[in-house]
């Protein structure tokens, strides 16, 4: 008799722990990826961002890797995925090559397994950055909500890397899990 | 037999709700404060917002507080911040002295334990507002997902509230916990 | 005896699997709807924008619904919600009725119980697409997090909805839910 | 030495015309607001005219608002005053002020010329 | 517009004396308030504005108070340098109008 009870709680206990390992003892994984100002690009034209920080001031990454300059997806889920992007021009950094530019960004996913590359969110505006100024900024913000599998790589794109704000506060991008997948 | 197996019981109850207290009766913070538009400070460099609705309109707060100005985090956690912040003239409103603005927001956290202030997110648009048209409006849009400890202050500052929209459709911030530290 | 711990144990699993279902197996609602590009109204005042899609390419959709233009809520909660709003003209598209263009979007809620609408989130901004450039474009993203009624739908509105541009990594709102409401 | 030098003053007879210029030196013109400020013999001062740093927005008090036109030459470092049908009572002294950054919507002055004579008189 | 009552418009005071001039505005002004200083012949100086922020290289001696409608403008200890008329000044809204001014003499 007291071995069946024993038994039966621990179905309970098995249970419990799973309901417990799944909502709150094993971690939603995130990330907040902060720009790396001394390995930006040059170009006009779309790049893409590989030099993050994930581990010094705000940058940070739990239950998610960061691998050849993409974030790469370990746990299947639906994940908020964001980004902020600023770009900025003072005088003294020298002449612009033209007043017109075209200011994006770009937040992409990759299957590995079906070699694809998708633009999940994209932002960004057209700027007049005349010379009557003698200083110029501009930012984005993207964000929405996407199922991620297991594997998934999500990067950056922008134009004009060259007049990206190279402070932690200005240009970064991030995830966060939500919810599994039914 | 039968007291051991109430508190047999009585651990698995134990257990079950303290993860149900956690997980979902101890509700997780959140906060969403309004522009109090009755009191804009005036300025044109960065200054702090000292003044926000948490309990009329769509304001609203729980297991957070708003003192002196600042959101106030009473729960350790990982948690999404995001700020609207949405500027405008219109010919009526007063003699504008330029029309060339720097519209900016910058949310900052600040720690008592360690009297620093840090800015976690910033955005805006420098801007060439001209008096060829009668109405000029700009907004910005910020998010991120921040470590915070309790008694950490988050705050927000920006650069011409003379300009901010009092609508508390316009101009918000807010945050609200999305997981745990581990 | 046997029947007294079976009993037990099945408040004990009952218990359990109410709190299950309603941290786990009872999905959190969410939605994500792209502009739906064959549908685009035209106008250049304020016009609610109906068609969306929640069941292709990145839109997607669970306990919540789509109907009649709007994304109606199913169970009582916080929301985070999101809108990314991008605008964009090239010459060849024909010439602009005026180079001075207000691109707004406003993220309304409708109480169909107390037929009301009320704006939650407001942003754009004015522009000037003069005729120098051949191509112009202007994002905006809000979000904002939100109590929302089971039968309360949110809806989007834009200004100059013929610029919209219709991918579906440019124009698209969402919807998660975060929390309960206590 | 940020200076501000006005010109152009001068005696008018009543309903006649006058263009009052301000050159400015020492400091990047083209990023402050300025105005014109006039003092009539032996009273205080009046704000007459203002005009936004880039030129697009111009401002004036109703008592002379449809005579005097402000302007600006960025490219020059010049702020100019046209005053058309002179009245006896916009005799005075007419100051080149600059406007002090502040708030966008308030107009305080920190840098002031030395003033140039306008008599309207028969 | 609105209407700047300065007072008293003339005062006679002895080197050291602390001198007070008052502004009233005829509507809530917040604290948009500057004080400037006109010696004979001579141009205006800024000295106070947004009613207490003293202007780059005024001494301490000169400071301003007050918000609303009610400001005041101090000079701790009267200097000979200090002779001129002192007016105020509304910026919160066009158009800006000035006080009718304050004498000050050494007695």
């Known amino acids: 008799g007291s071995q069946h009870i024993r038994a039966e709680k621990a179905m309970v206990d098995g249970s419990w722990l799973d309901l417990a390992k799944r909502s709150k003892l094993e971690a939603q994984p995130f990330a907040h990826l902060t720009i790396n100002a001394t390995d930006i690009p040059s170009g006009s034209h779309k790049v893409s961002l590989s030099s993050w920080y994930h581990d010094r001031g705000w940058g940070k990454i739990s239950n998610m890797t960061f691998s050849n300059g993409k974030l790469i997806v370990n746990q299947d889920g639906f994940y908020y995925l964001y980004a902020n992007i600023c770009f900025r021009h003072h005088e003294t950094s020298g002449d612009l090559a033209t007043e017109y530019l075209q200011l994006m960004v770009y937040v992409t996913k990759t299957s590995i397994k079906i070699p694809s590359s998708h633009t999940l969110m994209k932002g960004g505006s057209t700027k007049y950055w005349s010379g009557n100024s003698e200083f110029h900024f501009y930012s984005i913000n993207v964000g929405g909500f996407f199922k991620l599998r297991s594997g998934e790589e999500i990067s950056i794109e922008v134009s004009n890397p060259s007049l990206l704000d190279p402070d932690q506060d200005a240009t970064y991008f991030g995830a966060f899990k939500v919810r599994d997948i039914d | 037999g039968s007291q051991h197996i109430r508190a047999e019981k009585a651990m698995v109850d134990g257990s079950w709700l303290d993860l149900a207290k956690r997980s979902k009766l101890e509700a997780q913070p959140f906060a969403h404060l309004t522009i109090n538009a009755t009191d804009i400070p005036s300025g044109s460099h960065k200054v702090s917002l000292s003044s926000w609705y948490h309990d009329r309109g769509w304001g609203k707060i729980s297991n957070m507080t708003f003192s002196n100005g600042k959101l106030i985090v009473n729960q350790d956690g990982f948690y999404y911040l995001y700020a609207n912040i949405c500027f405008r003239h219109h010919e009526t409103s007063g003699d504008l002295a330029t029309e060339y603005l720097q519209l900016m927001v910058y949310v900052t956290k600040t720690s008592i334990k360690i009297p620093s202030s840090h800015t976690l997110m910033k955005g805006g648009s420098t801007k060439y507002w001209s008096g060829n048209s009668e109405f000029h409006f700009y907004s910005i849009n910020v998010g991120g997902f921040f470590k915070l400890r309790s008694g950490e202050e988050i705050s927000i500052e920006v650069s011409n509230p003379s300009l901010l929209d009092p609508d508390q459709d316009a101009t918000y911030f807010g945050a609200f916990k999305v997981r745990d530290i581990d | 005896g046997s029947q007294h711990i079976r009993a037990e144990k099945a408040m004990v699993d009952g218990s359990w699997l109410d709190l299950a279902k309603r941290s786990k197996l009872e999905a959190q609602p969410f939605a994500h709807l792209t502009i739906n590009a064959t549908d685009i109204p035209s106008g250049s005042h304020k016009v609610s924008l109906s068609s969306w899609y929640h069941d292709r390419g990145w839109g997607k959709i669970s306990n919540m619904t789509f109907s009649n233009g709007k994304l109606i809520v199913n169970q009582d909660g916080f929301y985070y919600l999101y809108a990314n709003i991008c605008f964009r003209h090239h010459e060849t598209s024909g010439d602009l009725a005026t180079e001075y263009l207000q691109l707004m979007v406003y993220v309304t809620k409708t109480s169909i119980k107390i037929p009301s609408s009320h704006t939650l989130m407001k942003g754009g901004s004015t522009k000037y697409w003069s005729g120098n450039s051949e191509f112009h474009f202007y994002s905006i993203n809000v979000g904002g997090f939100f109590k929302l009624r089971s039968g309360e739908e949110i809806s989007i509105e834009v200004s100059n909805p013929s610029l919209l541009d219709p991918d579906q990594d440019a124009t698209y709102f969402g919807a998660f839910k975060v929390r309960d409401i206590d | 030495e940020v200076q501000l030098v006005e010109s152009g003053g001068g005696l008018v007879k009543p309903g006649g015309s006058l263009r009052l210029s301000c050159a400015a030196s020492?400091?990047?013109?083209?990023?402050?607001?300025m105005s014109w400020v006039r003092q009539a013999p032996g009273k205080g001062l009046e704000w007459v005219a203002g005009?936004?740093?880039?030129?697009?927005?111009?401002y004036y008090p109703d008592t002379v608002k449809g005579r005097f036109t402000i302007s600006r030459d960025n490219a020059r470092n010049s702020l100019y005053l046209q005053m058309n049908s002179l009245r006896a009572e916009d005799t005075a002294v007419y100051y080149c002020?600059?406007?002090?950054?502040?708030?966008?919507?308030?107009?305080?002055?920190?840098?002031w010329g030395t003033g140039t004579t306008v008599t309207v008189s028969s | 517009d609105i209407q700047m009552t300065q007072s008293p418009s003339s005062l006679s005071a002895s080197v050291g004396d602390r001198v007070t001039i008052t502004c009233k505005a005829s509507q809530d002004v917040r604290t948009s308030i500057a004080w400037y200083q006109q010696k004979p012949g001579k141009a205006p100086k800024l000295l106070i504005y947004?009613?207490?922020y003293r202007y780059t290289g005024v001494p301490s001696r000169f400071s301003g108070s007050g918000s609303g409608t009610d400001f005041t403008f101090t000079i701790s200890s009267l200097q000979p340098e200090d002779i001129a008329t002192y007016y105020c000044?509304?910026?919160?809204?066009?158009?800006?109008?000035f006080g009718g001014g304050t004498k000050v003499e050494i007695k």
């Open positions: 002020a600059r406007r002090d950054y502040g708030d966008v919507y308030e107009w305080y002055f920190d840098v």
């Open positions: 020492g400091f990047t013109f083209r990023n402050y607001a």
């Open positions: 005009i936004s740093s880039g030129g697009t927005y111009t």
């Open positions: 000044q509304q910026h919160y809204s066009s158009p800006w109008t």
């Open positions: 947004s009613a207490s």
